[in-house]
């Protein structure tokens, strides 16, 4: 080994070197949290970049760059270091117009902590392993969600556009003429029935067990879907999102009530099956796989 490489190895294996990098990362994180950093922090930023560059140079000199088996770029953790340094120099010396997007990559510096703390490295390793093991469960989950999304699409397509529309129109007004002139929320409230405090028109349906309109209103299918158009079963993608929402139980009872009011209470069966299979079974299956992966990693 050349003297330079021997010195680099000595520095690399020294505990003080790890401590220096650790303190640098933590200090860097503190500086990144500053709202309006003073001018002198620019020089501190250069110092941090310099230390990171020195760290990488030491590693490259000690282990080699990329040719051998245990060289710098063969370790995925060093990829992070490399990216951090490249972006540090890019944002500083290359004029790329809107740099704010690139500045976001400075946050990656915080992730360097993982490679420095051994315990954290193990946990993250376990997490990555669990993600690899999750692939089969994920395929099963996506498949189940897709099947139920297709069923939802067939059962409820367009149903959430059903609204209670005012019967007593002016003599020259028609549904179409009104829809062409409606602009503001206030206009909508003139012609559609809204429950107090609701941001969407009252949903209704055409089956006997679906929601009925109050006196003076009739059920029509017109306009957009509830929640600014985001809640619907009108396309496969929207239906898939709705099913994902059921699986994760993200305000699912609202979706349940909306759909049952528009389609009919019989469709409660659909929701019972989805909640049992998707929310109770699949979610716990995912958790079980993650737990198994952590157990394996610990052993």
């Amino acid at each position: 080994f050349s003297p330079l490489r021997r010195i680099s190895i000595k520095i690399l294996v020294h505990s003080l070197f790890s401590m220096l990098i650790m303190c640098t990362i933590l200090t860097n994180c503190i500086f990144m949290t500053m709202n309006n950093p003073p001018d002198w922090t620019k020089n501190v930023e250069y110092t941090f970049t310099g230390i990171y560059t020195f760290e990488s140079l030491v590693k490259i000199l000690a282990r080699g760059f990329c040719v051998g088996e245990f060289t710098f770029l063969r370790d995925p953790w060093n990829w992070l270091d490399f990216v951090v340094i490249v972006f540090a120099y890019l944002t500083e010396f290359v004029n790329l117009g809107n740099v704010s997007a690139l500045r976001t990559f400075r946050v990656l510096r915080a992730l360097k902590t993982i490679s420095v703390i051994p315990g954290l490295k193990t946990i993250v390793g376990a997490l990555i392993q669990s993600v690899k093991k999750l692939s089969d469960v994920m395929i099963l989950t996506v498949f189940c969600l897709s099947v139920f999304a297709l069923i939802g699409l067939q059962l409820f397509m367009g149903n959430l556009k059903h609204k209670c529309f005012r019967n007593s129109l002016e003599n020259n007004e028609t549904l179409e003429s009104i829809m062409n002139t409606l602009e503001s929320e206030e206009d909508f409230r003139k012609y559609f029935y809204y429950l107090e405090g609701s941001k969407d028109a009252l949903l209704c349906g055409f089956s006997t067990d679906s929601g009925q309109c109050p006196e003076g209103y009739t059920c029509v299918k017109i306009g957009r879907n509830p929640d600014y158009g985001y809640t619907s079963f009108d396309t496969f993608s929207w239906a898939f999102l709705a099913l994902f929402r059921l699986m994760t139980q993200d305000y699912w009872e609202n979706l349940y009530q909306q759909t049952l009011r528009a389609a009919g209470k019989t469709y409660m069966i659909f929701f019972v099956v989805v909640i049992f299979l998707g929310s109770f079974y699949l979610i716990n299956l995912i958790l079980a796989v993650v737990a198994m992966a952590y157990e394996e990693q610990n052993q």
């Epitope: 397509m157 367009g158 149903n159 059903h162 529309f165 019967n167 007593s168 129109l169 028609t174 549904l175 179409e176 055409f206 006196e215 003076g216 009739t218 059920c219 029509v220 299918k221 017109i222």
Partner: nanobody, 124 residues
Framework: EVQLVESGGGVVQPGGSLRLSCAAS????????MRWHRQGAGKQREFVAR???????DYADSVKGRFTISRDNAKNTVYLQMNSLRPEDTALYYC??????????????????WGQGTLVTVSS
Amino acid sequence: EVQLVESGGGVVQPGGSLRLSCAASGRILRIGYMRWHRQGAGKQREFVARITDDSATDYADSVKGRFTISRDNAKNTVYLQMNSLRPEDTALYYCEALVTASVRGGSIHSGTYWGQGTLVTVSS
């Protein structure tokens, strides 16, 4: 496709009566309001009467007390009973309805539908 067909028009003497009917056909799920309009020769179309799905009625001032609108929800039909007819009632009578129906492969559509019209002539 939804169709509205009017019938019952004809020639009648002043003071006489006529009963117009308008039947909606198609895969109808719900009919909201149903309205009668008329258009005399060289005149603009004017509203005559309206009935909602909960049977609330409304009439033009010129026909109040003489005309009666009613509907049969089971048959998807609206009727206009016209009594004490006057020469100025001579017009082509149109039926209009707000219909929600199952169309094109089972998808639901709401819209305003019109009939072709039936001619009423009041003349001595």
